[in-house]
Interface confidence: medium
């Protein structure tokens, strides 16, 4: 699986999950998030050669098409597969609020 | 929606579904498919600016991150959202077989 366990341990050029730390204030301008100050959102990148973690029949077909027609601009793309939530603390006035934001952390990738 | 109805009518630079005809023999080397000779598989391409058909909170965050950090390599990617099946006819010996291949035709795209 193209997950953090595999991708963070290996120098993988093809589609894989990559570490990306996002600072809420500095990178997003989100001053309203009190805790955490930032988090590892991660992201997916890298080429999708034929059959690499193909998501659907279409991505398999497109991967083969791209292999046989390398000049073509159509090819599968490396995108998030499994995502995890992130719990944040923010304030409404002086009242603290804890909320779980869904699909915030990329754990693995696929070719779609 | 970034579907064929919208994308094929408009000269849209951002993420959209694009027409792609795939000929089973010429483009894939699949000589075993008897009918159809080929089909419109289509594909997704184009930049994913902030909030454009964002698939998850992560793609929204990444889109904003990319807007504020344009030199960063992390950005959402334009990938298939809705896919449709394709019915094919092939032969096993002299026996004709009809099969529906799932997720073969891209009907719309999203930024993931």
């Amino acid at each position: 699986a193209l997950d953090t366990n595999y991708c963070f341990r290996n120098l993988e050029e093809n589609c894989c999950v990559r570490p990306l730390y996002i600072d809420f204030r500095q990178d997003l301008g989100w001053k309203w998030v009190h805790e955490p100050k930032g988090y590892y959102a991660n992201f997916c990148s890298g080429p999708c050669p034929y059959l690499r973690s193909a998501d659907t029949t279409h991505s398999t077909v497109l991967g083969l098409y791209n292999t046989l027609n390398p000049e073509a601009s159509a090819s599968p793309c490396c995108v998030p597969q499994d995502l995890e939530p992130l719990t944040i603390l923010y304030y409404v006035g002086r009242t603290p609020k804890v909320e779980q934001l869904s699909n915030m952390v990329v754990k693995s990738c696929k070719c779609s | 929606a970034l579907d064929t109805n919208y994308c094929f009518r408009n000269l849209e630079e951002n993420c959209c579904v694009r027409p792609l005809y795939i000929d089973f023999r010429q483009d894939l080397g699949w000589k075993w498919v008897h009918e159809p000779k080929g089909y419109y598989a289509n594909f997704c391409s184009g930049p994913c600016p902030y909030l454009r058909s964002a698939d998850t909170t992560h793609s929204t965050v990444l889109g904003l991150y990319n807007t504020l950090n344009p030199e960063a390599s992390a950005s959402p990617c334009c990938v298939p959202q809705d896919l449709e099946p394709l019915t094919i006819l092939y032969y096993v010996g002299r026996t004709p077989k009809v099969e529906q291949l799932s997720n073969m035709v891209v009907k719309s795209c999203k930024c993931s």
Epitope: - | F8, Y21, D23, R25, Q26, K31, K37
Partner: antibody
Framework: QVQLVQSGAEVKKPGSSVKVSCKAS????????IHWVRQAPGQGLEWIGR????????DYSEKFQGRVTITADKSTSTAYMELSSLRSEDTAVYYC?????????????WGQGTLVTVSS | DIQMTQSPSSLSASVGDRVTITCKAS??????VAWYQQKPGKAPKLLIY???NRYTGVPDRFSGSGYGTDFTFTISSLQAEDVAVYYC?????????FGGGTKVEIK
């Protein structure tokens, strides 16, 4: 560069057959469809059929079904179009053309054309 | 079979004029339409594919648009060398039918 070179002009009697050749060069002949199109004098273009030289698979217009046979010889990179039971209305210029790589039936390279005259 | 109805059948325009040709398909062909130029005694030449994609080396005065059943081919500024017959072709399903052609002349 890609080239399609067709055989010379033919004069045929009604009821006979004609076989037009189309020699391809400059690309992998076996992996692109070859289409045949005709044009009667002063008229428009009419699609006849096509062949995939890689395995000989063919696809004909219903109008010509039963009268036309398209074949290909991979060893010489040549496609053939044979039309039988000729009548005067088959008098036309016959073109072969290659299906463009990465599109469907858009035809990017054409032969120079072969004039077939059917006359008694 | 899908019919392609092209209009006008002929037109005369001055050098520098904008010329528009239309093609109507009898059923939806999404955007699977090609446009060809044919000069007297010559084979057709591909100009546009997928309704709006200019083929390699084709001058940018030639353009195409459309989706579904209605397609348009435009020469933005007619040149003397553009005198020819122009054909549309649907490449959506076999048989790959052509329009009747439009003869373009200079006034």
């Amino acid at each position: 560069q890609v080239q399609l070179v067709q055989s010379g002009a033919e004069v045929k009697k009604p009821g006979s057959s004609v076989k037009v050749s189309c020699k391809a060069s400059g690309y992998t002949f076996s992996s692109s469809w070859i289409h045949w199109v005709r044009q009667a004098p002063g008229q428009g273009l009419e699609w006849i059929g096509r062949i995939y030289p890689g395995d000989g698979d063919t696809d004909y217009s219903e109008k010509f079904q039963g009268r036309v046979t398209i074949t290909a010889d991979k060893s010489t990179s040549t496609a053939y179009m044979e039309l039988s039971s000729l009548r005067s209305e088959d008098t036309a210029v016959y073109y072969c053309a290659r299906r463009m790589i990465t599109t469907q039936a858009a035809l990017d390279y054409w032969g120079q054309g072969t004039l077939v005259t059917v006359s008694s | 079979d899908i019919q392609m109805t092209q209009s006008p059948s002929s037109l005369s325009a001055s050098v520098g004029d904008r010329v528009t040709i239309t093609c109507k398909a009898s059923q939806s062909v999404i955007n699977a339409v090609a446009w060809y130029q044919q000069k007297p005694g010559k084979a057709p030449k591909l100009l546009i594919y997928y309704a709006s994609n200019r083929y390699t080396g084709v001058p940018d005065r030639f353009s195409g648009s459309g989706y579904g059943t209605d397609f348009t081919f435009t020469i933005s500024s007619l040149q003397a060398e553009d005198v020819a017959v122009y054909y549309c072709q649907q490449d959506y399903s076999s048989p790959y039918t052509f329009g009747g052609g439009t003869k373009v002349e200079i006034k």
